[in-house]
Each structure stands twice: as C-alpha cells, then as structure tokens.
Interface confidence: low
Amino acid sequence: VPRWRQQWSGPGTTKRFPETVLARCVKYTEIHPEMRHVDCQSVWDAFKGAFISKHPCNITEEDYQPLMKLGTQTVPCNKILLWSRIKDLAHQFTQVQRDMFTLEDTLLGYLADDLTWCGEFNTSKINYQSCPDWRKDCSNNPVSVFWKTVSRRFAEAACDVVHVMLNGSRSKIFDKNSTFGSVEVHNLQPEKVQTLEAWVIHGGREDSRDLCQDPTIKELESIISKRNIQFSCKNIYRPDKFLQCVKNPEDSSCTSEI
C-alpha cells in the first residue's frame, strides 16, 4: 500500500544531499588546518540525526546540538562580517579579504549553504519531494532552525567591531524579519562588541544618495544603541570598485570614495 506523504509548500531536499554534505566537509577540513581533526562521517551522522525520523515542523535547536559540538570552530571574533540580502557580494569580499569571515566561511555554514533538507516523522527517509516553507507551513523546520542556531552562535562569538553588509537596493535595507534583524542583531554581546558598522551597498551606478539616512537604517541604529553598542554606517557607492580595491589597495583610484 503506498504510504501517504505530507506535501509541503517548499522545495524538497537538495538532491544528493548526504553526498554533498560529506564532500563539502572533506574539502573544508582539507583546506583549513585548524579543522583537520574533524571526522566528517561523524559530522554527517550528527547532521542526519538532527532531522531524520523527526516531524519537520517540530525541530528544535537542541536537535542540532551534537552537530554544533562537532563543528565548534574558533574564528577571530573581531573579523566577523554579517550580511543581509546580499550574500554573493559578502562572499566575494571574504574570498578576497581572507582574514574576514562570514558564517558561510565556517565549517557549518559552508556545509549547509544553499541546501535544503528535511525528513519525515517515524521513517528514516529523506524527503526529496517537498519540505516545509517558513511562511506557508511552519517556522520550526530543519533548515530554518539550523540557520537560526548557527547564526545565533556566530553573533554571540563576535567582538570589537562587527561589520554587516546590507543591500541598499531593497525597499527595507534593514529588515527586522531577516536572520540578521531577528537573530544576529539581538545576539551581539554588548560586553564584547564595541561597534556595529553597516556597509550599505548601492545598486545603481548613479545613485549618490546617503542611504545611511534611510529610515530602516535609523531603526537599526536605534535597536543597536539601546543595546549599548555603538553604530556607524558607510555607503558603498561602487561595489565593483570596492571589491577591486580590496584586491588591489595600491591602485591609485582606490584612494577616492568607494
């Protein structure tokens, strides 16, 4: 008898999910000597254990604790780059400025980046057909809970000056409902973090507005100030030039405003 399967609103588990996670883990630990001790098979077992046989709307941060423990990693706490709605540029930046780190430059972030996964209650199967959508189905799904957990831990680890890259092309440059707005902002530790510096990335070539004056940025400033953390903001008018100058700071054109 065919077994009835819950149909969720979101896409199913990324194909070859187990192989992808394992391959990413091996690659990461090969290239990062400080993580050479990590046993990737154990990492996969812990990852799998967080969601297999569990109802995909009833996942908790506790489910991911074994994985968090295995993936414990020390990154320089004063070299953290957060981002919201502008992942590609943030990653291009840390690939050039290799002493700064986004969450996806850490092992756990790297493993899960751009992947989807979920299981089914009481079976050991991975659901490749559909997974819960955060809005339409439930927020306590395996992917959302994972990113909430690792994002909270990443923000808690930050110190000194923390940078965040924000997308100046969006209607809400700072969105309280994003992972940055709902998780990371509230888990920066005021006793460790002195300043949050926002980099607002402009989209249009001729856009010379001061987006640091945007109402949503003022809202971010207010939230941060209330948490006894200083706030500063910079416009990045030319993201292409910004990246080029990070690569090649001696270039004569890089002394002007970017």
Epitope: E30, I31, R98, K247
Partner: nanobody, 126 residues
C-alpha cells in the same frame, strides 16, 4: 580528494634555470594565496615565495629575491615558480601550498598553509 602536485624539478648546473609547476586537483586555487616552500637537506622548511589571490602582489624570501619569480595562470589551476641563476644553496625539495588568506604580507605564515604535496626535488650541482 583535494591535493596539490608539484613538478618541474631536476638536476641543473649552477647559473641554470628551472620552472616549477604547482597544479591543483580537486579544488580551484582561485581563492587562495599560494606559497612555495623549500626544504634543504638537514634544514627546516622555509617559505620562499608567495602570490596573492589577484596575482598582482608577490613576496619573496631574501635568499631568492631577484632570482625567482612566482606567477599564476588565469584558469586558477596552476602556480609557477621560475628559478633563474640557481646556486648550490637552492638544492632541496620544493613544495607549494594554499594559504588561508588572500594576501602575502608576510612569509612566516607556515601555520596558515596546509595540504602539503610530495614536493619536487631540485638539485643544483656541477
């Protein structure tokens, strides 16, 4: 399997030239500064050259500066070490390795290098 393979070594007379190649297998070198190291008989492995992520910036150890040139190809698969005016003191096993960082501001960054290959033997002798 992520690995780097060094090649191009050999026996050469003093004053001669060699070009070493460092080829990546299993990953791209694009996002890493790459260093060349050498280990002379009975000595510690030393950093001799580094090229950053852009290919624009290079650093050399004092012992090879002006004689060796490091470069990288555009495909992101190979880094070269052109060695001119070779001396007997250049004899050793030559290794390449990717750095964690994009820049080459210092050569004493052994701990940020990983994935050592087998190396390639260079012997300078008449």
């Amino acid at each position: 399997q992520v690995q780097l393979v060094e090649s191009g070594g050999g026996l050469v007379q003093p004053g001669g030239s060699l070009t070493l190649s460092c080829r990546a297998s299993g990953f791209t070198l694009d996002y890493y500064a790459i260093g060349w190291f050498r280990q002379a008989p009975g000595k510690e492995r030393e950093a001799i050259a580094c090229i950053d992520i852009t290919g624009f910036h290079t650093n050399y150890g004092d012992s090879v500066s002006g004689r060796f040139t490091i470069s990288r190809d555009n495909a992101g698969t190979t880094v070269y070490l052109q060695m001119n005016s070779l001396e007997a003191e250049d004899t050793g096993i030559y290794y390449c390795a990717p750095a964690r960082y994009a820049a080459c501001s210092a050569l004493d960054v052994k701990l940020s290098f990983t994935s050592w290959g087998q190396g390639t033997q260079v012997t300078v002798s008449s």
